[in-house]
Every structure is written in structure tokens, then in C-alpha cells.
């Protein structure tokens, strides 16, 4: 709609709304994956750079996160991942490039990779939510 502010121009109030939508999706996806894939360790080779370092309070780095969710989509709950991607798209700065992410070929490494993405993303959302809640923006 013509009323919509371009996504990179959303105020903290709207960013907070999106984070509130993302939190249960992320939490649910992580819990379901942990139940399904018991005993899979977190990978120490994957680091999701999910926060921007150039803004105060920290902003969710949607462009860095999106490629990971697009990559794991065929291997996880597509329905939930699509909802997460839809929300992240709203937070994406226009014209920001997305890098290509490849999923490890090894089955065990792949499971560890997915678990790590989900855990880091959940922690990231928590961090952004706290910063949005802590007084003046």
C-alpha cells in the first residue's frame, strides 16, 4: 500500500511489533528441532552475524540472516521458515545485497549447522527485544 513506509524506515515501535511476531516462531522452530534431533551439538564453525554494529540500539541484520533461512528452508519446517522470512523481509534495508549460503553436505554437520542458526537467531531476537524495551531509543 502507498501508506507503507519503506521497510528500512520503520520506527522502533514497528520493529518491536515484528520482533514480537518472530519470537514465538523462532522459539517454536528451535524447540521442535531440538526434540526431533536429540544429541546434535551446536557448531562452532557457524556464526550468524545477526546484529548490525552501526546502529544504536542494535538493529536486526535482516540481510545477513535471510540467506541462512533461505538455505535451511528445504531441510526444516517450510511453513514456519516462510513466516520467518516474511517478517525478516519487512526489516530488510532496501537494496542490501544478500550473500549465498551453502549448507554442509555431511548429514550430521548439516543438522548441527541448522541447530546453530536457530539457537543464534533466538538469542539475537532476545537481545534486540531487550534493547527496544530499555527506555529511550
Amino acid at each position: 500500500s502507498s501508506h507503507m513506509a519503506p521497510t528500512h524506515q520503520l520506527p522502533p515501535s514497528d520493529v518491536r511489533k515484528i520482533i514480537l511476531e518472530l519470537q514465538p516462531l523462532s522459539r517454536g522452530l528451535l524447540e521442535d528441532y531440538q526434540k526431533k534431533e536429540t544429541g546434535v551439538p551446536e557448531s562452532n564453525r557457524t556464526l550468524l552475524l545477526c546484529l548490525t554494529s552501526d546502529s544504536q540500539p542494535p538493529r536486526l541484520n535482516s540481510s545477513a540472516i535471510l540467506p541462512y533461512f533461505r538455505a535451511i528452508r528445504p531441510l526444516s519446517d517450510k511453513n514456519i521458515i516462510d513466516k520467518i522470512i516474511e517478517q525478516l523481509d519487512k526489516l530488510k534495508f532496501q537494496h542490501e545485497p544478500e550473500t549465498e549460503i551453502s549448507v554442509p553436505a555431511d548429514t550430521f554437520e548439516c543438522k548441527s549447522f541448522i541447530l546453530t542458526i536457530l539457537q543464534q537467531f533466538s538469542a539475537c531476537l532476545e537481545s534486540v527485544f531487550k534493547s527496544l524495551n530499555s527506555g529511550p531509543q
Epitope: S1, H3, M4, A5, P6, T7, H8, Q9, L10, P11, P12, S13, D14, R16, K17, I18, L20, E21, P24, K90, P136, Q137
Partner: antibody, heavy 118, light 111 residues
Framework: EVQLVESGPSLVKPGGSLRLTCSVT????????WKWIRKFPGNKLEYMGY???????DYNPSLKSRITISRDTSKNQYYLQLNSVTTEDTATYYC????????????WGQGTSVTVSS | DIVMTQSPASLSVSLGQRATISCRAS??????????MHWYQQKPGQSPKLLIY???NLESGIPARFGGSGSGTDFTLTIDPVQADDVATYYC?????????FGGGTKLEIK
């Protein structure tokens, strides 16, 4: 045309609970954000909170311990419950739609007046 | 919370003249060059009606006599020329930060 209509009791006893209904036509409450706002006798407007298209709720911290917003998507209605009311909660209560990020509340109900008195 | 201070509290203007209402936010409501400040009109016995969104955008169906300007912390609603139908209370509201907050209102009367 989007229409919102508030309904509920006009008189509530102190210490009791206030429950209001907002009936929406012309749009689905499974899209956008659906807000409650109230206007006190002195004309001051206060934002109370919302329920989102997915059912997520968020409240004004000043009311957090007393307020619940819920919905029934089959009836296209959403609700405000305010507990432990006092005479300070006497106000006209409005429901409103926030349809788009970065926009404003474009449709409001006509308002329903609630008096808290014994 | 962001405090919205409106002035004057009441305003009496002759028909055909200009009415100017000010709103000041206790902190900036801008992000990336956009102002998340809106103006509403409330006539007696009616609900608030959106006039201006994001500081200067005229809502669909609102006459061009209404205009909004400002950025950061200082905003203005202008009605020019004032008509008899404009008798109402006008409110500013910020949607920059939660909780959303409103100005105290400005009551417009005709001289």
C-alpha cells in the same frame, strides 16, 4: 468500508472487571493490528495495547498487570478485559485499526462510554 | 514514554482565517528522515478521525485546507481557511516508540 463497533457494559463496579467487544466488518482481524485506546473525561487519550493478525498481544506498561486483549477470529471480534477497575478507569473506550507499518490508526469505532461507580 | 505537548489548549479563529496548532515531542520521533507523528480530528460525540499521517501526508478524503509540517520534535497542523465544519478537538500522536502517546488536544472554536 471498514467498520468497528464497540459494545459492553456502561457501568462497572469498583474492583470488578470490564470486558468490551470490538466487532469488525469490512476487514479481517487476521491482518493488521487491532488496538484499544481510551479517552478520559478530561479529554486525555491513552493508548492501551493491541492484538496482531497472528494473535500476538502487546500492552501499555502502565496497564500490563490488569489488561488482556483477546480475539475470536470466527466472529471477527476482539476483546478488551480490564481487571480491578477503579473510578480512574471511567472513560470512553475506542477500538481502532493499524493496518500498515509506518502508517497510523485509520479506522476507529464510535466509542463506548464506561463509568466505574458503586 | 515520549511526552507530547500541544499548544494552545484552545483556539478561537474567524471563518476564512488560518488556524495553527503546535505539537512538541519530548524526544525526536524521526527515523531515517521520516517523522512518525500523526494528527486526528475529533468532533463532539464522534470518534477521532485521521487527518495527517507521518507529519505531512494528507489522509485520503481529507480536504487540502489541512496541512502538516515539522520534523524531529516540533510539528504543526495548519487549517487554512478555517470553515464552520472544522469545530473540533485536534490531537497529535506519535507512533515512533511504544507506548504510543497523544498530545493533550487543542479545541478549535469559531470566533
Amino acid at each position: 468500508e471498514v467498520q468497528l463497533v464497540e459494545s459492553g457494559p456502561s457501568l462497572v463496579k469498583p474492583g470488578g472487571s470490564l470486558r468490551l467487544t470490538c466487532s469488525v466488518t469490512g476487514d479481517s482481524i487476521t491482518s493488521g493490528y487491532w488496538k484499544w485506546i481510551r479517552k478520559f473525561p478530561g479529554n486525555k487519550l491513552e493508548y492501551m495495547g493491541y492484538i496482531s493478525y497472528s494473535g500476538i498481544t502487546d500492552y501499555n506498561p502502565s496497564l500490563k498487570s490488569r489488561i488482556t486483549i483477546s480475539r475470536d477470529t470466527s466472529k471477527n471480534q476482539y476483546y478488551l478485559q480490564l481487571n480491578s477497575v477503579t473510578t480512574e478507569d471511567t472513560a470512553t473506550y475506542y477500538c481502532a485499526r493499524y493496518g500498515n507499518y509506518g502508517y497510523a490508526m485509520d479506522y476507529w469505532g464510535q466509542g463506548t462510554s464506561v463509568t466505574v461507580s458503586s | 514514554d515520549i511526552v507530547m505537548t500541544q499548544s494552545p489548549a484552545s483556539l478561537s479563529v474567524s471563518l476564512g482565517q488560518r488556524a495553527t496548532i503546535s505539537c512538541r515531542a519530548s524526544e525526536s520521533v524521526d527515523t531515517y528522515g521520516r517523522s512518525f507523528m500523526h494528527w486526528y480530528q475529533q468532533k463532539p460525540g464522534q470518534s477521532p478521525k485521521l487527518l495527517i499521517y507521518r507529519a505531512s501526508n494528507l489522509e485520503s478524503g481529507i480536504p487540502a485546507r489541512f496541512g502538516g509540517s515539522g520534523s524531529g520534535t516540533d510539528f504543526t497542523l495548519t487549517i487554512d481557511p478555517v470553515q464552520a465544519d472544522d469545530v473540533a478537538t485536534y490531537y497529535c500522536q506519535q507512533s515512533y516508540e511504544d507506548p504510543w502517546t497523544f498530545g493533550g488536544g487543542t479545541k478549535l472554536e469559531i470566533k
